[in-house]
């Protein structure tokens, strides 16, 4: 199929970085500056992405590949190929329409992005709260109350080291 295609369509011989120029007897012409073609046989080149404003260039455009953008400090990428930049917040906050707001009591966010999430409800798993939650950290669940009955230890002590040549008592 490939051989047939190249015999029938001279454009299939045009490599990445060029376009098949219909105005000039289908010769392969180089992509203009600020454009690229990442595959062979294209009839036009594509406009390079411009990383402007809050976007900054992570990888320059070449004749065969598009530019890649990321976000300036204080922002993070969202969407496929970093199509959007969203403002960072502090840990313990979430981004709202009015800017960064502290997490409500009972919720936390341990990242600079995303929303505040509810603390884990330890009791749903029959466990107790070992360490209280904060705006920045989830609660730490401990053993269930049944495990904490008198005589029961929440932490298993390490086995005592045996001296060489002694059998256990």
């Amino acid at each position: 199929f490939e051989r047939t295609r190249s015999l029938q369509d001279p454009c299939s011989n045009c490599p990445a970085g060029t376009f098949c120029d219909n105005n000039r007897n289908q010769i392969c012409s180089p992509c203009p500056p600020n454009s690229f073609s990442s595959a062979g046989g294209q009839r036009t080149c594509d406009i390079c992405r411009q990383c402007k404003g809050v976007f900054r260039t992570r990888k320059e455009c070449s004749s065969t590949s598009n530019a890649e953008c990321d976000c300036t400090p204080g922002f993070h990428c969202l969407g496929a190929g970093c199509s959007m930049c969203e403002q960072d917040c502090k840990q313990g906050q979430e981004l709202t329409k009015k800017g960064c707001k502290d997490c409500c009591f009972g919720t936390f966010n341990d990242q600079k992005r995303g929303i505040c999430r509810p603390w884990t409800n330890c009791s749903l798993d029959g466990k107790s709260v070992l360490v209280n939650g904060t705006k920045e950290r989830d609660v730490v669940c401990g053993p269930s109350p049944a495990d904490l009955s008198p005589g029961a230890s929440s932490v298993t002590p390490p086995a005592p080291a045996r001296e060489p040549g002694h059998s256990p008592q």
């Epitope: 376009f19 992509c31 500056p33 600020n34 454009s35 036009t44 080149c45 594509d46």
Partner: nanobody
């Protein structure tokens, strides 16, 4: 109709200078992306330089950076390429080109002139 007429080529010794001109009609050079491409004997086309965006940002191929300067005279609707420190490898036919942006988002370019021959030889 878009027309581009190149002039200013010739025979020059290595290290010499030339100034190419491209008189445009049918469009305004100050409002379009325009530049110069060249074709050396037995080789394909190569972009040399361009003025991109109406803001006037310039592009130069690595092989000509620091030696060639692109400019335009809006009143005369003419594009120029000042070439200095010319080398044998600059020998080529030089064409004035207009970048064409298609409605579907594609980019190509127009070569409407006959080109002007530049030969660098001692």
């Amino acid at each position: 109709e878009v027309q581009l007429l190149e002039s200013g080529g010739g025979l020059v010794q290595p290290g010499g200078s030339l100034r190419l001109s491209c008189a445009a009609s049918g469009f305004t050079v100050s409002a379009e992306d325009v530049g110069w491409v060249r074709q050396a004997p037995g080789k394909g086309l190569e972009w040399v330089s361009a003025i991109l965006d109406s803001g006037g940002s310039t592009y130069y191929a690595e092989s000509v950076k620091g030696r060639f300067t692109i400019s335009r005279d809006n009143a005369k609707n003419t594009l120029y390429l000042q070439m200095s420190s010319l080398r044998a490898e600059d020998t080529a036919v030089y064409y004035c080109a207009r970048v064409v942006y298609h409605s579907g988002g594609g980019v190509t370019f127009d070569l409407r002139g006959q080109g002007t021959q530049v030969t660098v030889s001692s």
